[in-house]
Interface confidence: low
């Protein structure tokens, strides 16, 4: 006898992986036999060409490549819904309706949170490469490489959270170029190479002679945006300096950086970086559209020196 | 920068409809991300309402499906609350918001707006 | 869908280092939330993200003062050297996915006192 439409199989939520295609299923009982009409977001699917969607007699639905999607820009989430689709089972006793399945897209942005920097370690201590990967659906998995291949975590010594690397006790052969990669079903992408070099302790005693150095901080520029990082990498800059005193007592320098109040103003507090250079260096990181005052700071062990003048550079909009 | 700004009556009589638009300035809303209703009651609590996506997908909390509507006009770049059947348990100020990394982490709010159901 | 739990207050003095807790119920004790900060009279402000294996991802203009770790469901921010300006309310709030419905929900706060 005739009967209703019931929807025996619901559609699932997808993830849209690949070329595709991706499938929705959906299964009706009655008498007679109802027909399958789907729609999206509300909307009836046309099934006409150039529609990508195409309906097999079973009433699966096919789609043959992901529907138009917006496209997000620079800081904003990349929306990874494409729709939510359902279909409706019809005969002349009536319409059932299926639950609505989400379809979702993977997708892993090119823009790394942050970016590993290149550092000096000193043997024995612990170190940490930051790494913040870019921001993906599903979630990507970072793995660490290092000089070409995979490294290998070694429990105890190497403990990777949230996509940063802590190395427990720095050695001389953690010296290499070190890449952050992350990874989902949408692909991978690599993070910079950071070069870390491991120095040999040096017992200094707090070196009176660190007092009597002096820091002339020359020139801060801004360094042409690198295109591998993306559309609207981070800012960074090239720090000059120059050194007199005593014959190099300083072990390394740091940079020190915040961006600029109003006048009168309570100062930010000053961000401090380790630089790779003893004359010159690269600062990455910062941010587009703020004035930055700058200086470096000597140090040796745990004993610092006198910072170094301050200058102060605008930072445009956009590049 | 991007930017919202709430507006709407501050007062609404009980079983009427409230209805509030969030202007965007500084980003396309049918560029990307998901236009967020959120509202926070006089003892401090936050409930999300619900969200229109930048291609027009919409997810409402399910305590209120059956009274909540949120819409959007792409050439005003404005998106909608509607609120039927208010109660006295509706007053509240109404933020709308966006996330600008990881979904439903919202980064950018709206100043609020404070609505009170009275008659 | 998750439920977040915060104690209601918390207090610690000028200089000092408080560490808030929100804790996911056991379903969704893998989730990653968000904290917010709220000052009286303005809007809650996103301040960071923190995964459930305790890794955590400031917005940008919070200062290196407040960190954010994991442990089991709970999920934690930490701030060090107080300041007056860190008195606020500050929330917890969590996405889900329930069969194909998205959302969100957040803790009920916990107010925190300069002493």
């Known amino acids: 006898q005739d009967s209703p439409p019931q929807i025996l199989v619901h559609p699932q939520d997808q993830l849209f992986q690949g070329p595709g295609p991706a499938r929705m299923s959906c299964q009706a009982s009655g008498q007679p036999p109802p027909t399958i009409r789907w729609l999206l977001n509300g909307q009836p699917l046309s099934m006409v060409p150039p529609d990508p969607h195409h309906l097999l007699p079973d009433g699966t639905l096919l789609l043959l490549q992901p529907p138009a999607r917006g496209h997000a820009h620079d800081g904003q989430a990349l929306s990874t819904d494409l729709g939510v689709y359902t279909c409706e089972a019809s005969n002349r006793l009536g319409t059932a309706v299926s639950r609505g399945a989400r379809l979702s897209v993977a997708v892993l942005r090119e823009d790394f949170q942050i970016q590993p920097r290149d550092m000096v370690a000193v043997v024995g201590e612990q170190f940490t490469l930051e790494c913040g990967p870019p921001w993906g659906h599903p979630e990507p998995t970072v793995s660490w490489w290092k000089d070409g291949k995979p490294l290998a975590l070694q429990p105890g010594r190497h403990t990777v959270s949230g996509g940063s690397l802590l190395m427990a006790r720095a050695e001389k052969s953690d010296e290499g170029t070190y890449m952050c990669v992350a990874t989902n079903s949408a692909g991978h992408r690599e993070s910079r190479a950071a070069r870390v070099s491991i120095q040999e302790p040096q017992d200094y005693t707090e070196p009176v002679e660190l007092l009597a150095v002096r820091i002339q901080l020359e020139n801060v520029t801004l360094l042409n945006p690198d295109p591998a990082e993306g559309p609207k990498p981070r800012p960074a800059v090239w720090l000059s300096w120059k050194v007199s005193g005593p014959a190099a007592p300083a072990q390394s320098y740091t940079a020190l950086f915040r961006t600029q109040t109003a006048p009168g103003g309570q100062g930010a507090p000053w961000a401090e970086e380790l630089l790779a250079g003893w004359q010159s260096a690269e600062l990455g990181g910062l941010h587009w559209g703020q004035d930055y005052e700058f200086k470096v700071r000597p140090s040796s062990g745990r004993a610092r020196g006198p910072d170094s003048n301050v200058l102060l550079l605008r930072l445009p909009e956009k590049v | 920068q991007i930017q919202l700004q709430e507006s709407g009556p501050g007062l609404v009589k009980p079983s009427q409809s409230l209805s509030l638009t969030c202007s965007v300035t500084?980003?396309?809303?049918?560029?990307?991300?998901?236009w967020t209703w959120i509202r926070q009651f006089p003892g401090n609590n936050l409930e999300w309402m619900g969200y229109?996506?930048?291609?027009?997908?919409?997810d409402y909390n399910p305590s209120l499906t059956s009274r909540i509507s949120i819409t959007r006009d792409t050439s005003r770049n404005q998106f909608f609350l509607q609120l039927e059947s208010v109660t006295t348990q509706d007053t509240a100020t109404y933020y709308c918001?966006?996330?600008?990394?990881?979904?439903?982490?919202?980064?950018?709010w709206g100043q609020g707006t404070m609505v009170t159901v009275s008659s | 869908q998750p439920v977040l739990t915060q104690s209601p207050s918390a207090s610690a003095s000028l200089g000092a280092s408080v560490k808030l807790t929100c804790t996911l119920n056991?379903?969704?004790?893998?989730?990653?939330i968000g904290w917010y900060q709220q000052h009286r009279d303005k809007p809650p402000k996103y301040v960071m993200f923190?995964?459930?294996?305790?890794?955590?991802s400031k917005a940008d203009g919070i200062p290196d003062r407040f960190s954010g770790s994991s442990s089991g469901a709970d999920r934690y921010l930490t701030i060090s050297n107080i300041q007056a300006e860190d008195e606020a309310i500050y929330f917890c709030?969590?996405?889900?996915?329930?069969?194909?419905?998205?959302?969100?929900?957040f803790g009920s706060g916990t107010h925190f006192t300069v002493l």
């Open positions: 500084g980003y396309s809303i049918s560029s990307g991300s998901l």
């Open positions: 056991s379903q969704f004790s893998t989730y990653n």
């Open positions: 229109i996506s930048y291609a027009g997908g919409i």
């Open positions: 923190v995964k459930g294996d305790g890794g955590h």
């Open positions: 918001a966006t996330p600008g990394g990881y979904p439903f982490h919202f980064d950018y």
């Open positions: 709030g969590a996405d889900y996915n329930n069969a194909g419905q998205y959302g969100c929900v």
